[in-house]
């Protein structure tokens, strides 16, 4: 009678095993052991029992145990289980952006690992298991179906084997795959808002708004606003679910024409984009020339207005004749049009938009000076001891310097109040001098003395 | 326009000495004329001026000792006994009130009057 | 009599700084007073005339205010070529006046 001991074996691949065989008679003619394994016997006293040492076990065997007795021959086999945990658990790659709603399937794949009966792969979302399968094919392939949801932003998926040696008295081996961190997103099917002055002047700078809603999540969402070529470097806030981006947008003349103003909105995989068009114009204000800013009175004036060739003028509210870019008007200079405005309006389309520009210039009219009876008086009578505030008034622009002398060294204190006394009265030489000249008039004070009764 | 002082130099105390003011570019009829003397080291002193009237009006010290006069072209400052306290740079000037924006605009570089004996 | 007072008689100042003059009239000579500057060995140059206007080719850092009895020169971001002496003038009374002129002020600059 031949036996095996032990009889049954588990043990890790390229692991190695003591096997012992014995046989019943004293005096076997023959005992060993059957197997393609690489041995070594271990030498021990007496003749029944034989040990080997078998290694390098890479898969299932079952080596024999052999005896030859005077009673005849007979076998014991000896069963060697070999585990191994997989070589490769993984998930099968996906983008790592999902829209919200989708149907996402998992497919985790298992290469290797064995005792197949007890390896088993299981599908997680964090700790959550989706589906549990035992490992079957090479590879082994287990897959589930996710409706994506907005709850499931940034949660981490994967996959798990388990290969459960605990009944064989090893423990439960677990490999786990690289995880995929699934990025949730809504991006709603209306494009994005955008707010923009339809015409823009060469040289100014507008203010451009693109706005949507209904985005998660609203902070991953990248926003690109350009005019033509030009980039534009938005400012950008969010709300719960929504973002409003605002940019200057500067125009220069090599700007000039119609431009494609662009926002697009990119959130995942997935885009919105609004389209408008915006009209660069130039348009300068109208040029207002005087023949002369400044002119001596009962000079011929020439007030031109000249704008934008396409434009339209009014010159002091009065449209040009014919209707067009110029208009022009001609005035003798009197001392009432010193001060006076000419305002040019010219109005200009662009792009069914009425765009108006204005610039006025003042005439300057030089006259005087002038003294008159009216504004400065040649007799004044006031009593002694009174007070009394000559008044003297000059004309011209530019305004004169008004002196009021007698005997050409006692000024007379005009628009001051002054207590009347002897030394008051006399005639006083008025003079009122510009860069227009010099004219004077004589003012007499007559001083009444107080009757004494 | 111009004024021009003449006649300083030295004199003796309690002589008589009349210095000229020499103007041109405008008229005597119509501006007054005034003297105005400074000691060495000390500040301006206001003498007396002749109206374009020909009046005369004089610092309150200044009366009977000084007497201004004019012709067309000139004004003259007669000083009567002179003393050593006379010594100063006498100045003509063209009376200020009058002025477009000049006053006292006008002086004269002014003469020396020594009064020593 | 329309006497005329200065003061200081004499101000130390440094370059870049501001001076003030004041000057009063024993009464009323309305706006009618001037400011004069003398530099040794030359003859006065008219600064301010009617209180406040300002002499032509006279720079702006200059000013003249005040009217009646009271009134003031303000020299600001003084330079040295304004060392020299300053004077105040009435302009109002030619007669019964002892001076029309006030005593002076020396301004030296450091």
């Known amino acids: 009678q031949t036996s095996v001991s032990p009889s049954k074996v588990i043990l890790p691949r390229g692991g190695s095993v003591l096997v012992t065989c014995s046989t019943s008679c004293d005096q076997p003619k023959l005992l060993g052991i059957e197997t393609p394994l690489p041995k070594k016997e271990l030498l021990l006293p007496g003749n029944n029992r034989k040990v080997y040492e078998l290694s390098n076990v890479q898969e299932d065997s079952q080596p024999m145990c052999y005896s030859n007795c005077p009673d005849g021959q007979s076998t014991a086999k000896t069963f060697l289980t070999v585990y191994w945990t997989p070589e490769r658990v993984e998930l099968a790659p996906l983008p790592s952006w999902q829209p919200v709603g989708k149907n996402l399937t998992l497919r985790c794949q298992v290469e290797g690992g064995a005792p197949r009966a007890n390896l088993t792969v299981v599908l997680l979302r964090g700790e959550k298991e989706l589906k549990r399968e035992p490992a079957v094919g090479e590879p082994a392939e287990v897959t589930t179906t996710v409706l994506v949801r907005r709850d499931h932003h940034g949660a981490n998926f994967s996959c798990r084997t388990e290969l459960d040696l605990r009944p064989q008295g090893l423990e439960l081996f677990e490999n786990t795959s690289a995880p995929y961190q699934l990025q949730t997103f809504v991006l709603p099917a209306t494009p994005p808002q955008l707010v923009s002055p339809r015409v823009l002047e060469v040289d100014t700078q507008g203010t451009v708004v693109c706005s949507l809603d209904g985005l998660f999540p609203v902070s991953e969402a990248q926003v690109h606003l350009a005019l033509g070529d030009q980039r534009l470097n938005p400012t950008v806030t969010y709300g719960n679910d929504s973002f409003s981006a605002k940019a200057s947008v500067s125009v220069t003349a090599e700007d000039e024409g119609t431009q494609r103003l662009t926002c697009a909105v990119i959130l995942g995989n997935q885009s919105q984009e609004t389209l408008q068009t915006v009209t660069i114009y130039s348009f300068p204000a109208p040029n207002v020339i005087l023949t002369k800013p400044e002119v001596s009175e009962g000079t011929e004036v020439t007030v031109k207005c000249e704008a934008h060739p396409r434009a339209k003028v009014t010159l002091n509210g009065v449209p040009a004749q014919p209707l067009g870019p110029r208009a022009q008007l001609l005035l003798k200079a009197t001392p009432e049009d010193n001060g006076r405005s000419f305002s040019c309006s010219a109005t200009l389309e662009v792009a069914g938009q009425l765009i108006h520009k204005n610039q006025t210039r003042e005439l300057r009219v030089l006259y005087g000076p002038r003294l008159d009876e009216r504004d400065c008086p040649g007799n004044w009578t006031w009593p002694e001891n009174s007070q009394q505030t000559p008044m003297c008034q000059a004309w011209g622009n530019p305004l004169p310097e008004l002196k009021c002398l007698k005997d050409g060294t006692f000024p007379l204190p005009i628009g001051e109040s002054v207590t009347v006394t002897r030394d008051l009265e006399g005639t006083y030489l008025c003079r009122a001098r510009s860069t227009q000249g010099e004219v004077t008039r004589k003012v007499t004070v007559n001083v009444l003395s107080p009757r004494y009764e | 326009q111009s004024v021009e002082e003449s006649g300083g130099g030295l004199v003796k105390p309690g002589g008589t000495l009349t210095l000229t003011c020499t103007v041109s570019?405008?008229?005597?009829?119509?501006?007054?004329m005034g003297w105005v003397r400074q000691a060495p080291g000390k500040g301006l002193e206001y003498i007396g001026i002749?109206?374009?009237?020909?009046s005369t009006y004089y610092a309150t010290w200044a009366k009977g000792r000084f007497t201004i006069s004019k012709t067309s072209t000139t004004v003259d400052l007669k000083i009567t006994s002179p003393t050593t306290e006379d010594t100063a740079t006498y100045f003509c000037?063209?009376?200020?009130?009058?002025?477009?924006?000049?006053?006292?605009?006008?002086w004269g570089p002014g003469t020396l009057v020594t009064v020593s004996s | 009599a329309y006497d005329m007072s200065q003061t200081p008689a004499s101000v130390e100042v440094a370059v870049g700084g501001t001076v003030t003059i004041k000057c009063q009239a024993s009464?009323?000579?309305?706006?009618?007073l001037s400011w004069y500057q003398q530099k040794p060995g030359q003859r006065p140059k008219l600064l301010i005339y009617?209180?406040?206007k300002l002499a032509s080719g006279v720079p702006s850092r200059f000013t003249g205010s005040g009217s009646g009895t009271e009134f003031t020169l303000t020299i600001s971001g003084v330079q040295s070529d304004d060392a020299a002496t300053y004077y105040c003038q009435q302009a109002y009374s030619s007669s019964n006046v002892d001076n029309v002129f006030g005593g002076g002020t020396e301004v030296v600059v450091k």
């Open positions: 570019g405008f008229s005597l009829s119509s501006y007054a």
């Open positions: 009617d209180a406040s």
């Open positions: 000037v063209r009376d200020p009130y009058d002025s477009y924006d000049a006053a006292y605009r006008l």
């Open positions: 002749i109206g374009s009237s020909g």
């Open positions: 009464q009323s000579i309305y706006s009618y």
